[in-house]
């Protein structure tokens, strides 16, 4: 019979770290409705690709400084007469000297420095949310060439590929989330608890899953990162003829619990609780929160049916969770 | 109502291996823990294992590291334990229990197998 | 390893008394710690959870108590049905239990 919960503990994880993940169940296709939000490809999950932005600067860099056509004479005052013909093609100017790359890295440095400096007084907050793992890494043989002294200047690199090229700040990339509802009716018998699974993705507008771990046959989502999950439930709930028909008792109440690996008293969970002598014969019962999940735990709905009659929650009740971040 | 029947007294040689089994009713099986227990002839309770039948998770004592080994199959609802190597050590009666979910304490006990 | 203690491995009482049993960890258990009754015949059951908690069906004579690493069953009028042996057991880190306590009638 249901038992009312401890406290749950606030010190590091008891549990052991769990093996491999396993296999994707029949239950685990990734496949989905176009209706959901698509994978943002690499392109666009970083405003510039570094190596690109270079080579396009490579490739420009016969324009400017370095522009064939350059006049190596003085500048010429404008005359404001009318035009003449044109004359003839003039001779084959000698070739300008090719500025070495090193050069024209430095003069890069220079342009993105200064657009740094312009951003940074149009943004006094820097942004910390890109990601600046796979740019720092494909920067790295560039700002090997620079001079040691230029560390600032290639940090400063760094943060403009990192962060988006429009001002303003921007969301982080949503790594792993999902929204899934109850297929079918669960019957949950009186002084029971029930974890609920057989779970469907909705092919619906809005909808949702990114990133491994849901299991939608065993209804349990097994955290793809450590990190912060905002975790949320709402089930529909139907009341059950009571024995011997006698109204719901006072003392009568269900729990609608979000645990970590199935342990909702020694390890934190999500907790919602509701009084049943008022309640109607159909109601909503709903628990949201935060819960910190190692990689690899995971965590699913149950509810504690701690009353004297028998109740069914209802198909399209559902389970949901975002990383928030780590 | 929740019932742990586990299976009968098993009389072995030392040196063999024992498979001991323990069917769950009257729950579903698969949202929760079930740890294996040692008792020794008049002596105390000993914590072997636990297994968790939905991803087939275990943890072991250490002392019981390469001498137990637990399994589950969902489809008949039953845990297993196989002692190897057996020794006049291992002559003890042996438990199953479930693990609350909201308690996490052992609410429900095997009536424990003799070997 | 945490190491549970329970000092008194036999208690002799009379129907009516009250009863005290205790269990000493070798460390903070944070509370962590659950009582068993095993009766004469080899059955287990659960009393009490997480400390203090009364376990569905046991009658309200049971009690518990402690913090830390020290932890007592109070039975508080004995009854003959109460003639069993209880064990501690703390979830805190792994899973370890007393070594017991066998309470008789005088």
């Known amino acids: 019979s249901p038992e009312p919960g401890a406290p749950s503990r606030s010190r590091a994880r008891r549990e052991p770290p769990p093996g491999n993940e396993l296999p994707r169940g029949p239950g685990e296709s990734r496949a989905g409705p176009a209706a959901r939000p698509p994978e943002p490809t690499a392109e666009r999950a970083h405003s510039v690709d570094p190596r690109d932005a270079w080579m396009l600067f490579v490739r420009q860099s016969d324009k400017g400084v370095n522009g064939k056509k350059r006049s190596r004479g003085k500048a010429k005052k404008l005359k404001f007469g009318l035009p003449g013909p044109p004359g003839p093609p003039g001779p084959q100017g000698p070739p300008g000297p090719i500025i070495p790359p090193e050069a024209l890295l430095k003069e890069f440095q220079l342009l993105l420095k200064g657009a740094v400096r312009q951003r940074e007084r149009a943004e006094p907050e820097p942004c910390t949310c890109g990601p600046a793992g796979p740019v720092a890494a494909s920067l790295a043989p560039v700002s090997a060439t620079a001079g040691e002294d230029d560390d600032d200047v290639v940090g400063d690199v760094l943060a403009l590929l990192a962060a988006p090229l429009a001002p303003g700040p921007r969301a982080p990339r949503v790594e792993a989330a999902f929204l899934c509802r109850l297929r079918r009716d669960a019957l949950v018998e009186r002084r029971a608890l029930h974890e609920l699974g057989v779970y469907y993705l909705p092919d619906a507008e809005g909808a949702f899953r990114r990133g491994p771990g849901l299991n939608l046959t065993s209804g349990q989502y097994r955290a793809p990162v450590a990190g912060f999950y905002a975790l949320a439930a709402t089930l529909h709930v139907a009341l059950g003829e009571p024995p011997r028909r006698g109204p719901p008792r006072p003392r009568d109440h269900l729990r609608l619990l979000i645990c970590i690996q199935s342990r909702c008293q020694r390890n934190a969970s999500l907790e919602a609780i509701m009084g049943l002598e008022s309640s109607s014969e159909l109601f909503t019962i709903s628990v949201n929160g935060v819960l910190y999940l190692q990689m690899g735990q995971w965590t699913s709905v149950f509810l504690d049916n701690a009353s004297g009659c028998s109740l069914t929650v209802r198909s399209g009740s559902h389970f949901s969770a975002v990383l928030l971040g780590v | 109502q929740v019932q742990l029947q586990q299976s009968g007294p098993e009389l072995v040689k030392p040196g063999a291996s024992v498979r001991i089994s323990c069917k769950a009713s009257?729950?579903?099986?698969?949202?929760?823990?079930i740890h294996w227990v040692k008792q020794r002839p008049g002596q105390g309770l000993e914590w072997i294992a636990w297994?968790?039948?939905?991803?087939?998770?275990?943890e072991y004592n250490e002392k019981f590291k390469g001498k137990a080994t637990l399994t589950a199959d969902e489809s008949s609802s039953t845990a297993y334990m196989q002692l190897s190597s057996l020794t006049s050590e291992d002559s003890a009666v042996f438990f199953c229990?479930?693990?609350?979910?909201?308690?996490?304490?052992?609410?429900?006990w095997g009536q424990g197998t003799s070997v | 390893d945490i190491q549970m203690t329970q000092t008194t491995s036999s208690l002799s009482a009379s129907l009516g008394d009250r009863v005290t049993i205790s269990c000493r960890a070798s460390?903070?258990?944070?509370?962590?710690l659950n009582w068993y009754q095993q009766k004469p015949d080899g059955t287990v059951k659960l009393l009490i959870y997480y400390t203090s908690r009364l376990y569905s069906g046991v009658p309200s004579r049971f009690s518990g108590n402690g913090s830390g690493s020290d932890y007592s069953l109070t039975i508080s009028n004995l009854e003959q049905e109460d003639i069993a042996t209880y064990f501690c057991?703390?979830?805190?880190?792994?899973?370890?239990f007393g070594g017991g306590t066998k309470l008789e009638i005088k």
């Open positions: 057991q703390q979830g805190h880190t792994l899973w370890t």
């Open positions: 297994i968790y039948p939905g991803n087939v998770n275990t």
């Open positions: 229990a479930r693990e609350g979910i909201t308690t996490n304490a052992l609410d429900y």
């Open positions: 009257g729950y579903t099986f698969t949202s929760y823990y």
């Open positions: 460390q903070d258990i944070s509370n962590y």
